[in-house]
């Protein structure tokens, strides 16, 4: 299985310039057990929480928010009203934390781009990058020659195309430059996008018994599985400017279930430590 | 084991104030809402709103709003809720509730007569 | 505001046999993006504090005996008990999950005949 994903898209309606919309999806195999979606920084580090959505309890959102909603099993919109005649939801960077298992927790940060026109942001297009997966096979010289090929390869051949798949339309007074982005390639995400940073950190998660209502009773997600260690997965498209971390850590907050009687899956938030809050959906 | 501990029950006179606190425990309070919740005695459930601890952010059934204050202070992981202007109407048990609804305070009694 | 209303007010059932409480909504509780119905079942005793059973319509809470079970997609949800046992006298709410205010049924009281 590669390794799990999280974007995150922020789009200023063309209808009300004080409206934006914050769409977040997670690319992997695991069950979603519960996403948070704050603004001001990642939650839970310095960022305020805009919303918390759980698959099947319900939502919970607080102003600005105006409405938080699943688009699809793995991915989720939020809806901003933006009272204030500044705009200020225009320099602000939303981040979207997806608790799933098996994997842990993932999060991943965005913001509008810096002068793009309302409404102007496409829904995120998936584009072939290179897998994760493939460190662990070539090892990091070989991804990172491979990568350097495959940029070059991507290069050369939009040297001959007249027209970029990616633009948008000609009408457009600016296009998007459009970038694809891989994980766990620090130099590839650099080499795209100046704004993009990386954050890693594996925590496992263990599993003391198998819980009789649990992870089963989610349905799994129609994320793209890789069929091989050469296999393509997508991931959207992050607009310039997009800032972008990436964590594989345990929620040590949104993400947990308060303890329940019963057995569970016990996370332990940074690998040492007491025994995290425990919860069905992976967090018991 | 997550629980959630409320304060005792309470007589008070019409147009006086009442302060019921909720007292959390066994889970990272700031993490998800209090929920308040009442019931009158023989009457259904009525949410009142809830407080995010934390980033004391609410939200308020308009039937509530103006009369209802949610406040939480993470230090004490308490949270409370005050309804002023009080009514005969307003007598009910009070609940306080958290992880959309799956876990319950005990419940505050709340007396409004003169 | 969603309103939930619930049928019957009053059940009385035999121990043993099943026990059905319906709840309507005045909204669709589906929400199309994952299809799932935003509607929770709780149970409360004389006494005490409602206690959740069901949520997402039909996944039971831990702990839920499987005699309880719920059913139902848009605006008509059943909450079935297969086996009434003695202890199930109570009253049994629904509430709708799906959107602010939350709300919740009248209420059905569950009593044995």
């Known amino acids: 299985a590669g390794t799990p994903e999280v974007w995150v898209q922020v789009q200023m309606e063309a209808t009300e310039l004080s409206s934006f919309t914050v769409h977040c999806g997670f690319l992997g195999p695991g069950s979603i057990s519960l996403v948070t979606v704050s603004w001001g920084g990642p939650d839970g580090a310095g960022g305020t929480k805009l919303a918390v959505l759980h698959p099947e309890l319900g939502t919970r959102q607080w102003a600005p928010a105006r409405q938080a909603r699943w688009e699809t099993q793995s991915s989720i919109s939020l809806a901003l009203e933006d009272s204030g005649a500044s705009s200020p939801f225009a320099n602000t960077t939303f981040c979207c934390k997806f608790a799933s298992f098996p994997e842990g927790s993932w999060e991943s940060c965005g913001s509008l781009p810096p002068s793009s026109d309302p409404g102007l942001s496409a829904p995120p297009t998936p584009v072939p990058i290179l897998r994760a997966d493939l460190a662990g096979i070539l090892g990091l010289s070989g991804v990172l020659l491979f990568g350097c090929g495959y940029l070059l390869h991507l290069l050369r051949r939009q040297k001959h195309r007249p027209t970029p798949r990616l633009q948008p339309s000609h009408t457009n007074s600016q296009a998007l430059t459009a970038q694809a982005w891989a994980p766990s390639q620090a130099s590839q995400a650099a080499l795209h996008d100046p704004y993009a940073t990386i954050n890693t950190s594996f925590c496992p998660a263990t599993l003391d018994t198998a819980h009789p209502n649990g992870w089963a009773s989610l349905p799994t997600h129609a994320a793209h599985q890789p069929q091989g260690p050469a296999a393509s997965a997508s991931t959207p498209i992050l607009a310039r400017g997009s800032f972008v971390s990436v964590e594989n850590g345990l929620y040590t907050q949104a993400g947990e279930r308060p303890p329940h009687t019963g057995p569970g899956l016990t996370l332990f938030p940074d690998c040492r430590g007491p025994r995290a809050l425990e919860g069905r959906f992976g967090v018991r | 084991e997550v629980q959630l501990v409320q304060s005792g029950a309470e007589v008070k006179k019409p147009g006086s104030s009442v302060k019921v606190s909720c007292k959390a425990s066994?889970?990272?309070?700031?993490?998800?809402?209090i929920e308040w919740v009442r019931q009158a005695p023989g009457q259904g459930l009525e949410w009142i709103g809830e407080?995010?601890?934390?980033?004391?952010?609410?939200n308020y059934n308009e039937k509530f709003k103006g009369r209802v204050t949610f406040t939480a202070d993470t230090s004490t992981n308490t949270a409370y809720m005050e309804l002023s202007s009080l009514r005969s109407e307003d007598t009910a048990v009070y609940y306080c509730?958290?992880?959309?609804?799956?876990?319950w305070g005990q419940g505050t009694l709340v007396t409004v007569s003169s | 505001d969603i309103v939930m209303t619930q049928s019957p007010d009053s059940l009385a059932v035999s121990l043993g046999e099943r026990a059905t409480i319906n709840c309507k909504s005045s909204q669709s509780l589906l929400n199309s993006g994952n299809q799932k119905n935003y509607l929770a079942w709780y149970q409360q005793k004389p006494g005490q504090p409602p206690k959740l059973l069901i949520y997402?319509?039909?996944t039971r809470e831990s702990g839920v005996p499987d005699r309880f079970s719920g059913s139902g997609s848009g605006t008509d949800f059943t909450l079935t008990i297969s086996s009434l046992q003695a202890e199930d006298v109570a009253v049994y709410y629904c509430q709708n999950a799906h959107s602010y205010p939350p709300t919740f049924g009248q209420g059905t009281k569950l009593e044995i005949k």
């Open positions: 407080i995010l601890p934390g980033s004391n952010s609410t």
């Open positions: 997402g319509a039909s």
């Open positions: 509730s958290s992880y959309w609804f799956a876990y």
């Open positions: 066994g889970y990272t309070f700031s993490s998800f809402s």
